[in-house]
Amino acid sequence: DASGDLLNTEAHSAPAQRWSMQVPAEVNAEAGDAAVLPCTFTHPHRHYDGPLTAIWRSGEPYAGPQVFRCTAAPGSELCQTALSLHGRFRLLGNPRRNDLSLRVERLALADSGRYFCRVEFTGDAHDRYESRHGVRLRVTAAAPRIVNISVLPGPAHAFRALCTAEGEPPPALAWSGPAPGNSSAALQGQGHGYQVTAELPALTRDGRYTCTAANSLGRAEASVYLFRFHGAPGTST
């Protein structure tokens, strides 16, 4: 760091009171998954137990936008989250034990880039340190995966089918079902980040209904079966 305070001694070549931070050069993860950004540090203040703030920022050191911030009261091991961008960042490490490791949920391709950890001692040992190097997060594209397919009761004793898939880039969804035409109009719902949902609003015939998800990396399929026995509504999947 910009070196800490030196004791008032005339000793020559005293070690500069410096911090250090250990971060890996790179972390790789797939879109839609979670990633852990490890960060540990050492500091020159022996047994600091005062208030502290843990910060992660993106883009560039010292000046990039903060994506996560938490503060711990004196003596407390609990770091209260004050900022978690889009609610997707969570501290895994314990800053009191020199660990600032961060978990990032629901990764998107846009999360790729450099992340920098920082710790601030805001008590008597007024000091702070930030990693200049940072850790590079590489988020790779993901082939489609169907995470949920279901048949639900609809209006007027009818049934509807829902299909939710994830992938990066977000996949296009299509439903196909019993004849005639073998293909049915699907309502493509709003996606949440890397997830998309398509609804087939009215299942008019018994049989197999297939949801297909496709993007530039591949395709995935899943099916549900609708059977109605003795005129009573029911499903078998």
Epitope: D1, S3, D5, S13, S20
Partner: antibody, heavy 118, light 112 residues
């Protein structure tokens, strides 16, 4: 962009005190880092003199400790070097520089030349 | 104090040549936290020094990759793979592991 600019008298008489100012723009000296004074003697030898940290604490080169003082004016975003009892040996170009967390001087002023002569 | 000794004092080169500058410290500058705070600076005539390499081998932002640093303990080297006209000037090593921080005496890179 971060910029540092030294200013001073240029000429000082032996046994007097030297006062130099470093004005920082583009960054608050109370935000982070250590703010250093470094001098370069004729013949190009560089000497680190000391710093004042963002927190206000100071560290000096032990051989200068008896006559050096580094202070700051946070309202003007300036920090200062005072060197007492100067001799001709203190004639040099004086630089201010920002030291970041990795012990490196990433921003320097352009330097101000000081001559000690009677 | 930690004495930093640079060799050679002067290094005449032709443009396009490789150049190597050595820096030796009088004691180890491995800090107790595991880092070695050894930097290299270039000073061109009439200018303030500019940072090239920090912590032995890390190129500072904007520094061309023809500059590289290496070493450990007490022996360090700055290499320039293909000297260009803009590389001419005085090179200094610097240690920030121990107080007082100290600079090497400088190596002047000049045209042969």
């Amino acid at each position: 962009d971060v910029q540092l600019q030294e200013s001073g008298p240029g000429l000082v008489k032996p046994s007097q005190s030297l006062s130099l100012t470093c004005t920082v723009t583009g960054y608050s000296i109370t935000s982070d880092f250590a703010w250093n004074w470094i001098r370069q003697f004729p013949g190009n030898k560089l000497e680190w003199m000391g710093y004042i940290r963002f927190s206000g604490s100071t560290t000096y080169k032990p051989t200068l400790k008896s006559r050096i003082s580094i202070t700051r004016d946070t309202s003007k975003n300036q920090f200062f070097l005072q060197l007492n009892s100067v001799t001709t040996e203190d004639s040099a170009t004086y630089y201010c520089a920002r030291e970041d967390y990795d012990g490196l001087f990433d921003y320097w002023g352009q330097g101000t030349t000081l001559t000690v002569t009677s | 104090d930690v004495l930093m000794t640079q060799t050679p004092l002067s290094l005449p080169v032709s443009l396009g040549d490789h150049a190597s500058i050595s820096c030796r410290s009088s004691q180890t500058i491995l800090h107790s936290n595991g880092n070695t705070y050894l930097d290299w600076y270039l000073q061109k005539p009439g200018q303030s020094p500019k940072l090239l390499i920090y912590k032995v081998s890390n190129r500072f932002s904007g520094v061309p990759d023809r500059f590289s640093g290496s070493g450990s303990g007490t022996d360090f080297t700055l290499k320039i793979s293909r000297v260009e006209a803009e590389d001419l000037g005085v090179y200094y090593c610097f240690q920030g592991s121990h107080v007082p921080y100290t600079f090497g005496g400088g190596t002047k890179l000049e045209i042969k």
